[in-house]
């Protein structure tokens, strides 16, 4: 089979600070040295890119400085963290993995992780 399987959790609940973490694991059909990982958000039928990073196997995953994502990699597993989430960001987050080099190229699309974000209640005023 030439398809690349990507696994990710079905559901994740963001923290009260709007941070969600999940693992994206891929079954590499070949020995890739350069991998690109992209987080996509699917809302209705619209798909948008949340963040993306390319990394060399054995090296750290580096997102752009202004990215809302951070991550670490270990073998065929990527630990992804998305920050700054609000309730309106609740949705399906898809992990996309591309084995860029060496040939052949492979594409892997996960089934998506439903991230639930609940905005914290504002703290009531308190008298001291």
């Amino acid at each position: 089979c030439k398809a690349m399987h990507v696994a990710q959790p079905a559901v994740v609940l963001a923290s009260s600070r709007g941070i969600a973490s999940f693992v994206c694991e891929y079954a590499s059909p070949g020995k890739a040295t350069e991998v690109r990982v992209t987080v996509l958000r699917q809302a209705d039928s619209q798909v948008t890119e949340v963040c993306a990073a390319t990394y060399m196997m054995g090296n750290e995953l580096t997102f752009l400085d202004d990215s809302i994502c951070t991550g670490t990699s270990s073998g065929n597993q990527v630990n992804l963290t998305i920050q700054g989430l609000r309730a309106m960001d609740t949705g399906l987050y898809i992990c996309k993995v591309e084995l860029m080099y060496p040939p052949p190229y492979y594409l892997g699309i996960g089934n998506g992780t439903q991230i639930y974000v609940i905005d914290p209640e504002p703290c009531p005023d308190s008298d001291f």
């Epitope: 030439k2 996509l40 798909v47 993306a52 996309k96 080099y101 492979y106 594409l107 892997g108 699309i109």
Partner: antibody, heavy 118, light 108 residues
């Protein structure tokens, strides 16, 4: 408007060269991998070449390997195909196509005709 | 290389009838990586279905895709006059990207 517009096709003699261009507009070009696909008269679709986001990685069909070179200029939102040592069997309509975020080719240009004949 | 074989080569159908097109892969293709395109004479291909069964933006619901592994199907439930065209399947999970040879749907 989101679109791709090819140019550079024409009539060329066997052994000659041609450079095709594809101008992208209406989307963030650097966020997408791109392809060239061709279609010989009365025939089906044939994938020709692929280029990664930053242009560092390129893949080619065996039929064009060593003769065609794909490149991109993200600053100019443009994709290119340099075709050398052209043969009669390279005669086709050449399309540039965008890879959607989920993988299929969701945006195509109108095509440019390349005819290789003496 | 994954070889995609489409059948039939030509399908003659009357408007309003159902059309069923087949695409068989030489080896297993993940259902996430199979697409269908429509092409009319003188026009560029248009994406219809991706991920084997998801309709692309703006595609009417009379088009549906199904299948997994090596066998995939495109079904047009009720053919409209504008549906008479050539249809191609494609796998995009690994290089080289490959297309089927096409099925022409013509008016009976």
């Amino acid at each position: 408007e989101v679109q791709l517009v090819e140019s550079g096709g024409g009539l060329v003699k066997p052994g000659g060269s041609l450079r095709l261009s594809c101008a992208a507009s209406g989307f963030t070009f650097s966020s997408y991998t791109m392809h060239w696909v061709r279609q010989a008269p009365g025939k089906g679709l044939e994938w020709v070449s692929f280029i990664s986001y930053d242009g560092n990685h390129k893949y080619y069909a065996d039929s064009v390997k060593g003769r065609f070179t794909i490149s991109r200029d993200n600053a100019k939102n443009s994709l290119y195909l340099q075709m050398n040592s052209l043969r009669a069997e390279d005669t086709a309509v050449y399309y540039c196509a965008r890879t959607s975020l989920l993988g299929p080719f969701d945006l195509w240009g109108q095509g440019t005709m390349v005819t290789v004949s003496s | 290389e994954i070889v995609l074989t489409q059948s039939p080569g030509t399908l003659s159908v009357s408007p309003g009838e159902r059309a069923t097109l087949s695409c068989r892969a030489s080896q297993s293709v993940g259902s996430s990586y199979l697409a269908w395109y429509q092409q009319k004479p003188g026009q560029a291909p248009r994406l219809l279905i991706y991920g084997a069964f998801s309709r692309a933006t703006g595609i009417p619901d009379r088009f549906s895709g199904s299948g997994s592994g090596t066998d995939f199907t495109l079904t047009i439930s009720r053919l409209e006059p504008e549906d008479f065209a050539v249809y191609y399947c494609q796998q995009y999970g690994s290089s080289p990207w490959t297309f089927g040879q096409g099925t022409k749907v013509e008016i009976k």
